[in-house]
Amino acid sequence: YDFTNCDFEKIKAAYLSTISKDLITYMSGTKSTEFNNTVSCSNRPHCLTEIQSLTFNPTAGCASLAKEMFAMKTKAALAIWCPGYSETQINATQAMKKRRKRKVTTNKCLEQVSQLQGLWRRFNRPLLKQQ
């Protein structure tokens, strides 16, 4: 999906009002707060592409993020503020339902959510030069 035509300010507002709280909640109390940010993005469409991938695509060691509250709110924001996004997700969602297993949270999930926090922060500061 091409995120170029999304309403970025509306998505930013959704992030600031709710999604950010849920990400902080997920990470709260965690000792491993100093994860290295290995995923970066260069502009808002690119950031949303990376956010979508990390949030909804199961990875080795962390298959469970799509059911988290921050993920559901992310999905809702993208569906509302990115034209045509919902249609592209129907097949992906059906495929994921077939793969879903018992949720087990590991350090890999915590690391992944830490990466997501970095991507969202970058999304909110699009004019900053890439470090």
Epitope: I24, T25, G29, K31, S32, M69, M72, K73, T105, C109
Partner: antibody
């Protein structure tokens, strides 16, 4: 003054139902996760359930899952626990406690508790 | 679910330093919180997260963590510190759940 006041604890027969309430005051209620924690007479603290700041997420200890339902009404600054299929081992002092969303699992304000007795 | 293990009872001489420990797999990943409870009273949070002391908690209370063990240290124990102390943290088997330790009864001699 930041305060939590529980109510609704009574004597009930095994298999019965009960609804506990917790009235919050002195803080912005919808900024906080809320928990129920119980303590049987002479025993330690046992976490029962939590509900996220916006009510979107609820979680339960295995011992009450499927029988208890936590909810909140942010417009009334109130937390609830619907308790069904009560067992004698549910007899305890039930506390509500608040947990900042940024420290979801630490409970920084507690009520004085309400007593639930399940007995025939 | 995970378990947190505490010594049932610990004693300390007035004015001395005592350490109360809490062990469990979840503490490798998550910080513990510590609560003080006196008879007939509700628990009070004394330490949260890394070593955060809520306002009103004396600075003789401190927290630390190493491996799978969290510790609550009271430096210069006072008579009013006699109480039950509980640790809790997120549950490592399901990080949305909460687990409490069994509690430690502290006696100040």
């Amino acid at each position: 003054e930041v305060q939590l006041v529980e109510s609704g604890g009574v004597v009930v027969q095994p298999g019965g139902s009960l609804r506990l309430s917790c009235a919050a005051s002195g803080f912005t209620f919808d900024d906080f996760t809320m928990h129920w924690v119980r303590q049987a007479p002479g025993k330690g603290l046992e976490w029962v359930s939590l509900i996220s700041w916006d009510g979107g997420s609820t979680y339960y200890a295995d011992s009450v899952k499927g029988r208890f339902t936590i909810s909140r009404d942010n417009s009334k600054n109130s937390l609830y626990m619907q308790m069904n299929s009560l067992r004698t081992e549910d007899s305890a002092l039930y506390y509500c406690a608040r947990g900042p969303y940024y420290y979801f699992y630490g409970m920084d304000v507690w009520g004085q508790g309400t007593t639930v007795t399940v007995s025939s | 679910s995970s378990e947190l293990t505490q010594d049932p009872a610990v004693s300390v001489a007035l004015g001395q330093t005592v350490r109360i420990t809490c062990q469990g797999d979840s503490l490798r990943t998550y910080y513990a919180s510590w609560y003080q409870q006196k008879p007939g009273q509700a628990p009070i949070l004394v330490i949260s997260d890394k070593n955060n002391r809520p306002s009103g908690i004396p600075d003789r209370f401190s927290g630390s963590s190493s491996g799978n063990t969290a510790s609550l240290t009271i430096t210069g124990a006072q008579a009013e510190d006699e109480a039950d102390y509980y640790c809790n943290s997120r549950d490592s088997s399901d990080n949305h759940l909460v687990v409490f330790g069994g509690g430690t009864k502290l006696t100040v001699l």
